[in-house]
């Protein structure tokens, strides 16, 4: 305490010349905001991450921190700067009274402030059964020694680095940032402290039970002996990795974050920055039997978020809870009774369960893939993980009904061969957050920076929506869906694809109103139709039925309701060819599907007609799904007839390039 007071005196003296009053408030419309964890027991009031605007330099960060200290001291408050961030995010970590938040929010350069909060290891329980002697059935899994070109960073508990499984494979860094353990009588037992991290290191790269046996690992301690850490400690750990990467650039990096806390804007932002610096981040979806979007880093779009399934491909139940789910999960992986290194002895094994274990599997698979193809970008890696996953094997009944459509039915698997996937046109489906139920509410789905948005659709459980459209935002196309009055909200669904050297644009036809229907086609030479969207400004789209089949010889055409504007996504890319495939059902049906055949990839999925009884359309793997209202409410008139329209594409260019490599 004495030291702190001394520091204060120096600071106040040093800053006497600075203006005395509050810093000028930021310009209108750029007010800094305060964020805190939505889960009260996980909050850590008194410690705050002050995030500064993107372009802020380290010297400005330090000056802003000193300014806060000086102004707080004038008001009789003690503050302590615990860390100044640079390298990932500009800002600082400060210990201070919550009374100073208003003052801090008005400081120059401040973007937002987040109260610190807890993060937790995502394995339950930690010690189920000891397996001795340490014999693992080696006949079950014997891949090549993969992952040797890749370094995997593990942010977790301390680890037992001399365990036979991981000895010589894991380098323990000197990084440690953990909170004190809870409880006055807590007894630190080395084996307990190392339990979680040791097991996960073993799952990733263990000699006997590891996925990527050739991968080397580096461990950072951000979780204490109770498996608990902080958002701020994790941020400092991520910053440490970024600085290490800059000081000594190596090959591909994978960062495993087998932890979860409440939704954190700052943790997600740090993950985004690290991912954009070329690092692959893999995280646990969380063990809360809840929407993964409510947790961090699981909710960060740039992170590969992994849910847990068991040997029967069922979602893992963990006591009264279980794996998280929803649109923020990228895929699932084994996460129940996973055998791995136990910290109880250097040859012991144990089984643990949780989304941490599932994430470790995917980190291992990612290391294998990156070792085989070190130039893979994050977007390419994610698309490959999705592409090679086992499809539609998870029993969705375990998930809440409203989450089933949003949750990917994918279980991670190693590619049959680590080479030769280059010819494939890879696409994935990205769901937006729910729009909310008000008339003006919209939902936006975005692709990753190096993906192309090839089509856009929308879905509403109530059927009340005003369609969707592709629009430019910050130099990129996004997919925006529009709610309608009385609707419970909409989702936007983007089809995001890897299409090198693509030049895509959106062609729009306004409502035709007087004619039979609205039409738009790709008129530019060499451009092919990859997707159709329709958006209407009227609340009640009439029952007008447009011609479902497009005229012969005009495959590059979107058709729709005469009161809707129609948007065609038109792309030019070397060797790209696309075709339209339709499946119409004359009688009312709750679901109509159409799939692309082998060798073709679904890029667009839409419904005809776009009338109010159609709930929407979305892509599931290579199948276009169109959902309609309950048959009983539709009647059996022709109004119930629905057609699912799929646009299937392939790239001859990618196929040729791949053949040339072989």
């Amino acid at each position: 305490q004495e030291d702190e007071d001394g520091d204060y005196e120096e600071l106040v003296l040093a800053l006497r010349s600075e203006e005395d009053g509050l810093a000028e408030a930021p310009e209108h419309g750029t007010t800094a905001t305060f964020h805190r964890c939505a889960k009260d027991p996980w909050r850590l009031p008194g410690t705050y991450v002050v995030v500064l605007k993107e372009e802020t330099h380290l010297s400005q960060s330090e000056r802003t921190a000193r300014r806060l200290q000086a102004q707080a001291a004038r008001r009789g408050y003690l503050t302590k700067i615990l860390h100044v961030f640079h390298g990932l995010l500009p800002g600082f970590l400060v210990k201070m009274s919550g009374d100073l938040l208003e003052l801090a929010l008005k400081l120059p350069h401040v973007d937002y402030i987040e109260e610190d909060s807890s993060v937790f290891a995502q394995s339950i329980p930690w010690n189920l059964e000891r397996i001795t002697p340490p014999r693992y059935r080696a006949d079950e899994y014997q891949p090549p020694d993969g992952g040797s070109l890749v370094e995997v960073y593990l942010l977790d508990t301390s680890i037992q680095s001399d365990h036979r499984e991981i000895e010589g494979r894991v380098m323990v860094t000197d990084f440690e940032n953990v909170p004190e353990e809870d409880g006055t009588r807590f007894h630190r037992q080395a084996s307990k402290c190392d339990s979680h991290g040791t097991h996960l290191a073993g799952v990733v790269s263990g000699r006997d039970a590891g996925v990527a046996k050739g991968a080397s690992m580096r461990s950072l301690r951000v979780l204490n002996c109770q498996g608990k850490g902080t958002v701020s400690g994790t941020l400092i750990g991520l910053e440490f990795i970024r600085k290490s990467q800059l000081v000594q650039p190596v090959g591909p990096l994978v960062v495993l974050l087998p932890l979860a806390g409440g939704y954190s804007r700052v943790l997600n932002a740090a993950c985004q920055r690290l991912a954009r610096a070329g690092v692959v981040l893999v995280t646990a979806a969380g063990n809360f039997r809840d929407d993964a979007c409510l947790y961090s880093p699981a909710s960060a779009p740039e992170v590969i978020t992994v849910g847990a399934t068991n040997a029967q491909d069922q979602p893992v139940t963990l006591g009264t809870l279980g794996t998280n789910f929803g649109r923020c999960v990228d895929l699932f992986a084994p996460g129940e009774d996973i055998i791995g290194a136990s910290s109880d002895c250097s040859t012991c094994f144990v089984s643990q369960s949780g989304t941490s274990q599932a994430a470790a599997h995917v980190a291992g698979i990612a290391a294998m893939m990156l070792s085989a193809e070190p130039e893979l970008t994050l977007a390419e890696l994610r698309q490959r993980l999705i592409h090679f996953s086992a499809k539609d094997v998870i029993n969705e009944a375990w998930f809440p009904e409203d989450q089933r459509v949003l949750t990917p039915n994918l279980v991670a698997a190693l590619p049959p061969s680590t080479h030769g996937a280059g010819w494939q046109l890879f696409c994935r489906t990205v769901w937006s957050a729910h729009s909310g139920p008000t008339r003006m509410a919209t939902a936006v789905a975005r692709c990753a920076p190096d993906e192309e948005l090839l089509s856009c659709s929308s879905f509403s459980r109530s059927g009340k929506r005003r369609g969707e459209r592709m629009e430019a935002q910050g130099g990129k196309l996004v997919c925006r869906a529009h709610n309608a009055f009385g609707g419970e909200g909409v989702y936007a669904i983007a089809r995001c694809c890897l299409l090198p050297q693509a030049n895509c644009s959106v062609h729009t036809a306004p409502p035709a109103e007087a004619s039979m229907g609205t039409r738009v086609h790709c008129h530019q030479q060499g451009h092919v139709l990859t997707g159709c969207s329709s958006h209407w400004e009227v609340e009640d789209l009439g029952t007008h039925k447009p011609p479902v089949l497009r005229p012969r010889g005009q495959p590059n055409q979107c058709v729709g309701h005469r009161e809707a504007s129609i948007h065609a996504s038109c792309c030019h890319a070397p060797g790209l060819e696309c075709k339209v495939k339709e499946h119409g059902i004359p009688a009312p049906q709750e679901q109509v599907t159409v799939a692309c055949e082998e060798g073709w990839t679904l890029t667009g999925c839409s419904a005809l007609p776009g009338t109010s009884h159609v709930l929407g359309a979305y892509a599931v793997d290579n199948t276009c799904v169109v959902r309609s209202r309950d048959v009983s409410t539709t009647g059996s008139t022709s109004e119930g007839a629905v057609t699912a329209v799929a646009i299937c594409c392939r790239s001859r260019h990618l196929a040729q390039a791949s053949q040339e490599l072989q």
Epitope: S435, T438, R439, A441, G486, V538
Partner: antibody, heavy 118, light 108 residues
Framework: EVQLVESGGGLVQPGGSLRLSCVVS????????MHWVRQATGRGLEWVSG???????SYTGSVKGRFTISRENAKNSLHLQMNSLTTGDTAIYYC????????????WGQGTLVTVSS | EIVMTQSPATLSVSPGERGTLSCRAS??????LAWYQQKPGQAPRLLIY???TRATGFPARFSGSGSGTEFTLTISSLQSEDFAVYYC??????????FGPGTKVDIK
């Protein structure tokens, strides 16, 4: 009791700027679409702009690119930043709410007068 | 945009008499129409929505009808507090939400 109170009106020269605010009470602000509607003296009503709880915005053609609607849900406040004002923007500006169950603007503020004149 | 017209511009009625106000849309707005009442120096008040549903706080003498492009607001027996300007508004196609020019109901 639901209340909407506008402020920020006044006299401004053509080409100038003004920022209107509307502070609400008596309901959960972050659950509702909010709108600005204006009325020139002795004239009818004209919808200007609207904003959804999450910040989705919409404008009438004549103000697009000049006016910006925004909201601070934590502070129960709605704003309208008006730039490049013309004499045609002279009016009483009302903020209004739309309920998800009742279409139309069910609650209005008392209005704030904006006069654009040289 | 959808243009709304109202007739008459002014309606002069004696207290106790019936008042009928018309509103026409340039294209169909289904039943997505509201009526507002505005008294001098006051903000408008939502009177009718969905073309025919009365908003809370207004008595049964106010009724709305119509759909598509033709709408009517009827005040069965005008009371002194009913003398005001009445506006119709469509919210079927937006942006923008559009209002009619108003009908002034004054004392004969």
């Amino acid at each position: 009791e639901v209340q909407l109170v506008e402020s920020g009106g006044g006299l401004v020269q053509p080409g100038g700027s003004l920022r209107l605010s509307c502070v609400v009470s008596g309901f959960t602000f972050g659950d509702y679409d909010m709108h600005w509607v204006r009325q020139a003296t002795g004239r009818g009503l004209e919808w200007v702009s609207g904003i959804a709880p999450a910040g989705d915005t919409s404008y009438t053609g004549s103000v697009k690119g000049r006016f910006t609607i925004s909201r601070e849900n934590a502070k129960n406040s709605l704003h309208l930043q008006m730039n490049s004002l013309t004499t045609g923007d002279t009016a009483i500006y009302y903020c209004a709410r739309e309920d998800i169950a009742v279409p139309g603007f069910d609650y209005w503020g008392q209005g704030t007068l904006v006069t654009v004149s040289s | 945009e959808i243009v709304m017209t109202q007739s008459p511009a002014t309606l002069s009625v004696s207290p106790g008499e019936r008042g009928t106000l018309s509103c026409r849309a340039s294209q169909s707005v289904s039943s997505n129409l509201a009526w507002y009442q505005q008294k001098p120096g006051q903000a408008p008040r939502l009177l009718i929505y969905g073309a025919s549903t009365r908003a809370t706080g207004f008595p049964a003498r106010f009724s709305g009808s119509g759909s598509g492009t033709e709408f009517t607001l009827t005040i069965s027996s005008l009371q002194s507090e009913d003398f005001a300007v009445y506006y119709c508004q469509q919210y079927n196609k937006w942006p923008p939400f559009t209002f009619g020019p108003g009908t002034k109901v004054d004392i004969k």
